[in-house]
């Protein structure tokens, strides 16, 4: 464990800093200049620094479970858990699920009535008795309901020609009902005759494009529990179709832009506002179904199985069955799907704030274990065989009191989890002994909490009418700085710098703004190590023989000396045994300047006066040409030929000397003077 803390001045702040942090409440644990924050550290560190084990405050997260034995059949236990959460430290508890036998079932049959489902409708009309019989094999209390859908009644989903709206079927002789989005036909009932009668009245309909408005219909079935008649039992929604589905965004094709609002809009058992709202998104529908504990069974023809299998990956607790072309196998399909659904258990929770994190370890009866998952998941769950989930809840900060529920998807049982913060320190301070705080405050977890008008570690400083802001002001460098640079205590308007636990680090300065460690490093050591230099308030002071911002250079100039032992040829300065040349001159010794302008034109008047004592500088040659020295012998260097003041050509050679603008000049004896026209 580690404890990373920032500006901790109380036990609570320490506990909030992380699960590895503990607080020492021992009196006089801090020495002069020590910050209160040194009371906050890992348990081993505090023990090592002399804090007794019973002086260490280390509240831990814990879970208390309560069983609620009232009410009927319970598949989840416990029913209530109270968690006390310390930030960063998980509290864990077990949830047991025992699948009950004969749990009541509500089954709503939602059928596509587009024209291609004509033969299916014939078979479903005879289905009522078979469906209820099949349910009664599984449960003592089964109910069935019925609804149907086609699509939104605008182009391009249906043909809006008045004749086609009256009778959308391709066969004019066929009796056919106008298209509609969703019709709730039969409320959930245990009367199979009523199912037969109501479904028997249904007529086929038709639409234009291949996908249907099934998601619209499913959303209404989930959003209208009273109208559908859902009980608080296992809820199955059989969705029978031979085609795909429209989803959010498709409404734009029919100029329907308002997003689906996920609310109930049934009037006279019809979804009359379907042309006002777009289709729901798959995620939106999945959320609504889970919220209402509805488990969809997609009964679809063979060519659509793959499509709906993809849908079940997004919708939890859903299943797909292959429907024969005429729906004759639907009862068998529902039985299989129900067995599949009820043998898979997902444990999940409602939405939580970012400050709470929940993970699940699933210990399934077949020996399979899933750890640290965002939800519990066990497959092949058998009747009366308990399975266990370990739920771990972590708070990232000191949370407000709140609660959330955990449910097994598709089942009505819930576990209510109440969450409380575990951030207070129950310190055993010397009652209300004020003597340790100069009688001007009381002890709280080893620290003096001073009365108004007093401040300081032991309330030793009287503010004397000065506000604490004024006193603190003299402990700040400026208004934007923090008190004593955050590295000391402001005691009666003066900074008392903290002692550092970093070896070799001394904090000092009027505002504790300086230390002996925050300087540039060389070879991994501050100022190159104690042999090269020392750190003073952010700057290295190098020992004799060393230089550089981190004392990284030996003070030698050997690499800067030219053959005449002139540093950087007088055209630069030596830093760290390397020349820093003046503009244009090149390393290593600032000897050449290829980019510099030719000096020839600059020195013609000097050549003229030095050699011939003529020209504009004739009278004060040495003052005008201080950097030039006349040579009587030829020199090596730049050869020049320029016109003098009399229009004669003068040839001369400039040999650069050490320094800037210093040359040895050799001037040819003869000038070339061109005679003018006579």
């Amino acid at each position: 464990q580690e404890c990373t803390k920032f500006k901790v001045s109380s036990c609570r702040e320490c506990i909030e800093s992380g699960p590895g942090c503990t607080w020492c409440q021992k009196l006089n644990f801090t020495g002069p200049g020590d910050p209160d924050s040194i009371r906050c550290d890992t348990r081993p560190q505090l023990l090592m620094r002399g804090c007794a084990a019973d002086d260490i405050m280390d509240p831990t997260s814990l879970a208390e479970t309560q069983e609620d034995h009232n009410g009927g059949q319970k598949q989840l236990s416990p029913q209530k858990v109270t968690l006390y959460l310390r930030p960063g430290q998980a509290a864990a508890f077990n949830v047991t699920f025992r699948r009950a036998k004969g749990y009541p079932i509500d089954l709503y049959y939602l059928m596509d009535l587009s024209y291609s489902m004509l033969d299916d409708l014939r078979n479903v009309k005879k289905l009522g008795g078979d469906l209820l019989r099949a349910l009664n094999e599984i449960t003592e209390s089964g109910r069935i309901g019925f609804g149907s859908f086609v699509d939104k009644t605008v182009l391009p989903f249906v043909n809006t020609h008045p004749d086609k709206l009256r009778n959308p079927c391709p066969n004019k002789e066929k009796e056919c009902q106008p298209p509609f989005a969703f019709r709730h036909v039969l409320k959930l009932t245990n009367n199979s005759n009523q199912f037969q009668t109501e479904v028997g009245k249904q007529l086929i309909s038709g639409n234009l494009d291949a996908p249907e408005g099934g998601l619209d219909a499913m959303m209404q079935v989930a959003a209208c529990p009273e109208e559908i008649g859902w009980r608080n039992v296992t809820r199955l929604l059989v969705f029978a179709t031979d085609d795909g589905f429209h989803f959010a965004g498709d409404g734009k094709l029919g100029a329907i832009l308002t997003p689906n609002d996920g609310r109930c809009h049934l009037e006279d058992n019809l979804y009359k506002r379907s042309n006002e709202f777009d289709y729901p998104s798959v995620g939106q529908l999945a959320h609504k179904l889970a919220e209402n504990n509805i488990q969809p069974i997609f009964a679809v023809t063979s060519r659509m199985v793959k499509t709906y299998e993809k849908l079940t990956e997004i919708i939890p607790k859903s299943a797909v069955g292959e429907l024969s072309e005429d729906s004759s196998n639907v009862v068998h399909l529902i039985k299989n799907a129900y067995n599949k659904l009820s043998s898979r258990v997902f444990l999940d929770h409602n939405a939580l704030p970012d400050t709470l994190k929940v993970t699940y370890d699933s210990f399934c009866s077949n020996g399979v274990t899933h750890r640290n998952q965002p939800r519990g998941d066990c497959d092949g769950v058998q009747i009366n065989v308990p399975i266990t989930f370990q739920v771990k809840v972590t708070a990232t900060e000191c949370i407000q009191e709140q609660s959330f529920v955990i449910r097994a998807l598709g089942f009505t049982d819930i576990v209510t989890v109440q969450v409380l913060p575990q951030c207070e320190c129950r310190c055993r301070d010397q009652s209300r002994d004020r003597s340790l705080c100069h009688g001007k405050g009381f002890l709280e977890c080893g620290i003096c909490r001073c009365d108004t008008g007093y401040i300081g570690k032991n309330c030793e400083c009287q503010t004397q009418g000065r506000s604490s802001q004024e006193l603190e002001g003299s402990c700040r460098k400026d208004n934007n700085s923090i008190i004593c640079s955050g590295l000391g205590d402001c005691v009666c308007g003066q900074c008392l710098c903290h002692t550092s636990d970093v070896p070799g680090k001394l904090i000092y300065g009027q505002y504790c703004e300086c230390d002996t460690i925050n300087c540039e490093r060389y070879n991994g050591q501050v100022c190159g190590g104690p042999g090269r230099g020392l750190c003073f308030c952010g700057k290295c002071r190098c020992h004799p023989g060393f230089e550089g911002s981190a004392c990284q250079c030996e003070r030698t100039t050997e690499g800067c000396l030219n053959p005449r032992r002139v540093e950087c040829s007088g055209r630069g300065r030596c830093r760290c045994n390397v020349c820093e040349c003046h503009s244009g001159y090149q390393l290593p010794l600032c000897q050449e300047c290829p980019g510099c302008p030719s000096p020839c034109g600059k020195y013609i008047s000097c050549a003229e006066c030095l050699k011939f004592e003529k020209g504009p500088f004739g009278k004060n040659c040495s003052a005008a040409c201080p950097g030039l020295q006349l040579s009587n012998n030829p020199v090596k260097g730049r050869t020049c030929k320029e016109r003098d003041s009399e229009g004669c050509w003068v040839a001369y050679t400039l040999e650069q000397q050490d320094g800037m603008d210093r040359y040895l000049i050799y001037v040819d004896e003869s000038r070339e003077c061109v005679a003018g026209p006579n």
């Epitope: 690499g559 390397v578 090149q586 390393l587 290593p588 000897q591 050449e592």
Partner: nanobody, 117 residues
């Protein structure tokens, strides 16, 4: 990295001549200046002569007029030493520089020149 190998040293009578050579290998394309240094026993190392890629040469006062530095290609530099004196006795080292960093780190093993009187 550039390697420098000096050769041509030996024992010579005062007034005699020697021609030292320094061959470079490695990444030599960036070298701009080559130089000869020498170190006599118990003395500091001193720069004798330099030559740049442009042909600019520079000599110490003691070498001027007696020694000539030349470069026959980018890779080899020579020091022609005439009128040798006993005080020229030293280990002679070759050194190279780049425009970007100045003198390159490291030295060759040097070549011993001994001038007897």
């Amino acid at each position: 990295e550039v390697q420098l190998v000096e050769s041509g040293g030996g024992l010579v009578q005062a007034g005699g001549s020697l021609r030292l050579s320094c061959a470079t290998s490695g990444s030599v394309s960036s070298i701009n200046v080559m130089a000869w240094y020498r170190q006599a026993p118990g003395k500091q190392r001193e720069l004798v002569a330099t030559i740049s890629t442009s042909g600019y040469t520079d000599y110490s006062d003691s070498a001027k007029g007696r020694f000539t530095i030349s470069r026959d290609n980018k890779n080899t530099v020579h020091l022609q030493m005439n009128s040798l004196k006993p005080e020229d006795t030293a280990v002679y080292y070759c050194r190279a520089s780049t425009l970007r960093t100045g003198w390159l780190m490291g030295w060759g093993q040097g070549t011993q020149v001994t001038v007897s009187s």
